[in-house]
């Protein structure tokens, strides 16, 4: 007769171990008793567990509900045990030692590999603002056994490096992203990608980067001239600019305060009907909490009644 | 052959506790499993708990939580810590030695009583 095992059992912590020995021997051969043992290179071999043809499972009190065997049906010839909610501790060699008759007793040895799948976290780094050279975006850190493979999965350009600790049952890999910021990177994805023996897919972690920001400012209004002369309603000046974090808009006039009827809408300057007292610099000064731009347009109403004067429309940043 | 012996039974109250001993001589080499049965008046001899060279053990549902068995194989003893008792515990408590060529319980302890009382 010869024993039936596998050299290494693979399961995921928290699981159900099945440790397969089963007996194939001649019709007329009998199993008296299968004991399971963990060998310890340390503590030398302790029982597990002890399957006895009549008298049924004896388990080590160490080991108290935690070594069944498999549910039914059993075939008399399967010394198979299942260890119960697998932890790391467990991991190791296991030998199973049948005792037969007549042919007398046979052993096997195997090993319990317990994989500890790891929990991903993702840090972001410092705040990412344009014009910074080189500059940390996230890490990401996850812990197992064996140890996990971190990468990243992003369509912006970047350079990765990892590093990993070894503690005595299991390894913690870092992998950080490092880039330089440009406002193009607003809002991508960069996505911590895990992968493990134990997992049935890759963990993946995304974070959307933020890239602080702010662009020059423009006013944009005084391209129709038509629209610039006295009686004329709905003119209005916008100012253009953009940023992160979302900037704010603010009007003056450079040679005094805004004529009475104007009313500044966010981003926009709009006019009554437009008479000479509306003519002036005006400015619009955006900002967020990065920086701050101005832009300036000179802006000329015309008095259509006075055909000396042309419409004369500067603009100035 | 194996002999064995056992001591320790008595009369206790319910809710008390007894300790059984048993000592093992002769062919000792033999023994596989060593283990307690017990036999109340007109009922079938039943294994209470029987315990492995190597420490393992197996308890009958209705002791379990409640009886302890112990094991020397250098002193070739084996012990049965019985708490909690109830009335039906009341028996007659066996010692037996498994040899490892028959794999069945073939050597016995002359007997010792125990009964509980309400």
């Known amino acids: 007769g010869e024993l039936e095992t596998s050299d290494v059992v693979t399961v995921v912590l928290g699981q159900d171990a099945k440790l397969p020995c089963f007996y194939r021997g001649d019709p007329d051969e009998q199993v008296g008793q299968v004991a399971w043992a963990r060998v310890d290179p340390n503590e030398g071999i302790r029982e597990l567990a002890l399957l006895h043809s009549k008298y049924g499972l004896h388990v080590n009190p160490a080991y108290e509900d935690r070594v069944e065997q498999p549910p039914p049906p059993r075939d008399p010839l399967d010394g198979s045990v299942l260890l119960r909610n697998a932890v790391q501790a467990d991991e190791g060699e296991y030998e199973c030692r049948v005792s037969t008759f007549p042919a007398g007793s046979f052993q096997a040895r195997m090993r319990l590999r317990v994989l500890v799948p790891p929990l991903p976290s993702l840090n972001p780094g410092p705040p990412l603002e344009e014009g910074q050279g080189l500059t940390l975006a996230a890490s990401c850190t996850a812990e197992g056994s064996p140890a996990p493979s971190v990468t990243w999965d992003t369509e912006v350009k970047g350079t990765q490096s990892s590093r990993s600790f070894t503690h005595p049952r299991s390894a913690a890999v870092t992998s950080e992203f490092h880039l330089v910021p440009s406002r193009s990177m607003n809002g991508q994805p960069l996505t911590c990608v895990v992968s493990h023996p134990g997992l049935l897919q890759d963990r993946r972690i995304t974070h959307t980067l933020q890239v602080a920001f702010l662009a020059e400012a423009s006013v944009r209004g005084l391209e129709d001239q038509n629209l610039w002369q006295v009686g004329r309603e709905g003119a209005t000046l916008k100012c253009l600019s953009e940023g992160q974090p979302p900037p704010k808009y603010n009007w003056t006039r450079l040679d005094g305060p805004l004529p009475s009827g104007v009313r500044v809408k966010g981003d926009t300057l709009g006019f009554p009907p437009l008479t000479t007292e509306h003519s002036g610099v005006y400015v619009c000064h955006v900002s967020n909490e990065l920086s701050s731009r101005d832009s300036q347009v000179t802006v000329e109403v015309l008095d259509p009644e006075d055909p000396g004067k042309q419409v004369d429309l500067v603009s100035a940043s | 052959e194996v002999q064995l012996v056992e001591s320790g039974g008595g009369l206790v109250q319910a809710g008390g506790s007894l300790r059984l001993s048993c000592a093992a001589s002769?062919?000792?080499?033999?023994?596989?499993?060593m283990g307690w049965f017990r036999q109340a008046p007109a009922k079938q001899r039943e294994l209470v708990t029987s315990i492995s060279p190597g420490g393992s053990v197996r308890y009958a549902d209705s002791v379990k939580g409640r009886f302890t068995i112990s094991r020397d194989v250098a002193k070739n003893t084996v012990d049965l810590q019985m708490n909690s008792l109830k009335p039906e515990d009341t028996a007659v408590y066996y010692c037996a030695a498994e040899s490892e060529r028959t794999y069945y319980f073939d050597s016995w302890g002359q007997g010792t009583q125990v009964t509980v009382s309400s």
């Open positions: 002769g062919s000792i080499s033999s023994i596989n499993l």
